[in-house]
Each structure stands twice: as structure tokens, then as C-alpha cells.
Interface confidence: medium
């Protein structure tokens, strides 16, 4: 993939990969980064209670509604 692909996808994204199977109770803080010029996708960074920071999949069922509320200001998205 050439530089055009980088412009389309990576740009300056925070998350290179996401971690699966994280229990919500392990999360102490959640940061949601909207799509923007810096990155072409929504990114979710979770601070865990053990001090680690990981990236989560915004499509994960337990996150979807939370992210919709954050991104859409209470508007219900499809």
C-alpha cells in the first residue's frame, strides 16, 4: 500500500490495533476520538485500573451505545 493508502487510513491515528475481550469493569477511563483530518476512523482509548492504556474496537457491543452518545450528543444513530 502506497502513500495514498496512508492518507486514507492511517494519517495520525492513535491506535494501530485494538484489544478484544476487555471486561468493562477493568476500565477506569474512556477517551473517544472522533473521525477527523488526523485519523479517518473513530478511536477508543481505555485506561485500565492496572494503569495500562489500550485501544478498543468502537464496534464492540458494550461500547456502541456509549460512543453514539458521545459522538452524537444524545442523538440516536441507526
Amino acid at each position: 500500500a502506497g502513500p495514498a493508502a496512508a492518507v486514507l487510513r492511517e494519517l495520525r491515528c492513535v491506535c494501530l490495533q485494538t484489544t478484544q475481550g476487555v471486561h468493562p469493569k477493568m476500565i477506569s477511563n474512556l477517551q473517544v476520538f472522533a473521525i477527523g483530518p488526523q485519523c479517518s476512523k473513530v478511536e477508543v482509548v481505555a485506561s485500565l485500573k492496572n494503569g495500562k492504556e489500550i485501544c478498543l474496537d468502537p464496534e464492540a457491543p458494550f461500547l456502541k451505545k456509549v460512543i453514539q452518545k458521545i459522538l452524537d450528543g444524545g442523538n440516536k444513530e441507526n
Epitope: L8, R9, G36, E77
Partner: antibody, heavy 119, light 107 residues
């Protein structure tokens, strides 16, 4: 729910220009990309370009540079596509669509705007 | 530009039949592939994204698979409402490009 309402059909003369609008509702306009797609009978679907209104950021297909200009009015949550120097080749249905959580797919589509270029 | 070769261009199938449509990219698109259904005089409807994920509200009879250059859309049991034209879209590299479409009709 998410809705993209496009402007109505246009009959325009060759050599003139036209502006198509796409009014978004049901979500925060500045948090997603708006893409524009052209469809001509027998030619399938063709990506024109996309726009991130939160930062006035646009990408265009090489085929549409100098033909299409994408803009947005965030106060009314409306995206616009302006087409210039129209010829019969520009006669088509034009769709706007909204990205999903990733710019790389189109989650919601407008109903389409038919542009007919004829003298 | 990446070329998307979609096949077949048209097909007919019976109710309840399993239907598969394929798309081949001219290079690796890393699963940045989505599928859209379009009925005459209507706008496209999103079915599948990231090659395998089902869009909201899409019946579970639709599924997507594939990786690298080769992808497919499967309808496990065809229903009358599924008669339409289906398009694949790669968005792995700019510009995004669509397949030419597969027109699916009932036998």
C-alpha cells in the same frame, strides 16, 4: 434516526453549473465524513470525493478534480456539491452518503439527486 | 487505481437457494471492503463492511467473507426481497472503487 435529504431533480443546459445539497439530521454532522457518488445507467457507481466538515477537509477523485467542489455549512448540517462546465456525460444520479465509524465505508445514503444536462 | 472484478454480472436463483457473489481486487485491500444492495430507482443500502461485519438492521441471511484480494457476499437462503443489484466497494486505497455490480433475479 440518521437521514440525508438531498435536493430535487435539476434540468440544466450544457456549459452551465449546478449545486446539489445534502441535509443531514439525526447525528452530529461534524463527527463523520460525507461522500459523494455518481451513478449513470450502464456505468455503475463512481466515487467523486469526500468531505470531513469538522475541519473542512476534502479528497477528490482525479476524475472529478476541476469538475466537482465539495463544501459544507455546519450551522445547517448541510453538505453541497457544485458541478461546473456541465456536459451530457454529467447527466446522472448523484448520491451523498455518510461514513460509519471509519471513513472506509458508507453507513447511510441520501435518496439521490437526478441531474439532466440537455439543450 | 485498484480494479474490482465482480462476478457474476447477473444471475438468477430460486427462493431458498444459497447465493454467492464474488469480488476480486487487483491487489491486497486488507479487508477494506463493503457490500451494498441497490433496488431500481432507490439509493444503495449498506449490507456488509470490513469484509465480514453485518450493518445494522441487515438480516442475518447475509454474510461476507474473504481477505487479501478475494471477497464474497453470501445469501444463505434467498428471499423475494433480495432481488436487486449488489455492488462491492474497496476503500483500502484512494480512490475507492466499486465493482461493476451483480444483478440478482428470481428464477
Amino acid at each position: 434516526q440518521v437521514q440525508l435529504q438531498q435536493s430535487g431533480a435539476e434540468l440544466v443546459r450544457p456549459g452551465t453549473s449546478v449545486t446539489i445539497s445534502c441535509k443531514a439530521s439525526g447525528y452530529t454532522f461534524t463527527n463523520y465524513w460525507i461522500v459523494w457518488v455518481k451513478q449513470r445507467p450502464g456505468h455503475g457507481l463512481e466515487w467523486i470525493g469526500d468531505l470531513y466538515s469538522g475541519g473542512g477537509y476534502t479528497f477528490y477523485s482525479e476524475n472529478f478534480k476541476g469538475k466537482a467542489t465539495l463544501t459544507a455549512d455546519t450551522s445547517s448540517s448541510t453538505a453541497y456539491m457544485h458541478l461546473i462546465s456541465l456536459t451530457s456525460e454529467d447527466s446522472a444520479v448523484y448520491f451523498c452518503a455518510r461514513s460509519g465509524y471509519d471513513r472506509t465505508w458508507f453507513a447511510h445514503w441520501g435518496q439521490g439527486s437526478l441531474v439532466t444536462v440537455s439543450s | 487505481d485498484i480494479k474490482m472484478t465482480q462476478s457474476p454480472s447477473s444471475m438468477s436463483a430460486s427462493l431458498g437457494e444459497r447465493v454467492t457473489i464474488t469480488c476480486q481486487a487487483s491487489q491486497d485491500i486488507e479487508s477494506y471492503l463493503s457490500w451494498y444492495q441497490q433496488k431500481p430507482w432507490k439509493s444503495p443500502k449498506t449490507l456488509i463492511y470490513y469484509a465480514t461485519r453485518l450493518a445494522d438492521g441487515v438480516p442475518s441471511r447475509f454474510s461476507g467473507s474473504g481477505s487479501g484480494q478475494d471477497y464474497s457476499l453470501t445469501i444463505s437462503s434467498l428471499e423475494s426481497d433480495d432481488t436487486a443489484t449488489y455492488y462491492c466497494l474497496q476503500h483500502g486505497e484512494s480512490p475507492p472503487t466499486f465493482g461493476a455490480g451483480t444483478k440478482l433475479e428470481l428464477k
